[in-house]
């Protein structure tokens, strides 16, 4: 389960209301860090181990997911044809 945490605003600059947001994720046994719907998420460790990246549903709703060659990452293809590529190191 992940929640979005807003870190404290920059109090040294009162006119600025910029706040940093970060995900705080507590994974269950058998889960590790991943990406679901383009956001940080806890996913089945077996997905990461086998590099079946699309099984963690990393793309936004309506986008198509495809594995990169050698399972080095994935691509998310928008309905309009724009492709976003994510590689895993």
């Amino acid at each position: 389960t992940c929640e979005i945490v807003t870190l404290d605003r920059d109090s040294s600059q009162p006119r600025r209301t910029i706040a940093r947001q970060t995900a705080r994720c507590a994974c269950r046994k058998g889960q590790i860090a991943g990406t679901t719907r383009a956001r940080p998420a806890c996913v089945d460790a077996r997905i990461i181990k086998t590099k079946q990246w699309c099984d963690m549903l990393p793309c936004l709703e309506g986008e198509g997911c495809d594995l990169l060659i050698n399972r080095s990452g994935w691509t998310c293809t928008q309905p309009g044809g724009r492709i976003k590529t994510t590689t895993v190191s």
Partner: antibody, heavy 129, light 103 residues
């Protein structure tokens, strides 16, 4: 090099308490789930306890549940095991172990016994009157 | 409980296989020689630490993991424990250990 160095063992009396420590070096301690595993003389390995990388989650084996408390100090890169109401069957060598998975920032991760990639040399505990 | 054979024997140069089943998530294999520290030879099913010889390999099939030592050497004689999570997925568990004898 990854180093895990246990301490705190020795001769203990039944009903007493002890606190084991495991000093870690050579890696980012705060990114790894950690374990305590023990081995009675001439016997096999037994799962004792584990803790998430950030210390928010703990788990215990049935033999020590209710008598043991695992904790960690990520600032000092040290793992602890507090054992109360000691019994003769707690006698054995206690090992500290690291789960290989590197948990990224913002995540709290459990280790996995099958992912243990590093062990300490162990500290011997003898519970006897 | 995990299931692994109590003993396995092989001649030098032969292939030794040790199986472990009954757990979930991932499996590891831990070597222990008399009077020596525990050494991980395989973790996360098939990962091998950099200082472990390539003759050690692990493979997962279903819920059974097999440790294979290809070209067994005399120094491989030891007790081998498998480790994983119990079937409930809530706590760690170890096999009773397999004694590998090199004939």
């Amino acid at each position: 090099a990854v180093t895990l160095d246990e301490s705190g063992g020795g001769l203990q009396t039944p009903g007493g308490a002890l606190r084991l420590s495991c000093s870690a070096s050579g890696f980012d301690f705060s990114s790894h789930g950690m374990f305590w595993v023990r081995q009675a003389p001439g016997k096999g390995l037994e799962y004792v306890s584990e803790i998430t990388n950030d210390g928010s989650g703990t788990n215990y084996g049935s033999a020590v549940k209710g008598r043991a408390t695992i904790s960690r100090d990520n600032g000092q890169s040290t793992l602890y095991l507090q054992m109360n109401s000691l019994r003769a069957e707690d006698t054995g060598t206690y090992f500290c172990a690291r789960s290989s998975y590197v948990c990224p920032g913002g995540f709290s991760c459990w280790g996995d016994t099958g992912q243990i990639d590093a062990w300490g040399h162990g500290t011997e505990v003898i519970v006897s009157s | 409980a995990l299931t692994q054979p109590s003993s396995v024997s092989a001649n030098p140069g032969e292939t030794a296989k040790i199986t472990c089943s009954g757990g979930v998530y991932s499996y590891g294999w831990f070597q222990q020689k008399p009077g020596s520290a525990l050494v991980t030879v395989i973790y996360w099913d098939d990962e091998r630490p950099s200082d472990i010889p390539s003759r050690f390999s692990g493979a997962l099939s279903g819920s059974t993991n097999t440790l294979t030592i290809t070209g067994v050497q005399a120094e491989d004689e030891a007790d081998y424990y498998c480790g994983t999570e119990d079937i409930s997925g809530t706590a760690g568990v170890f096999g009773a250990g397999t004694t590998l004898t090199v004939l």
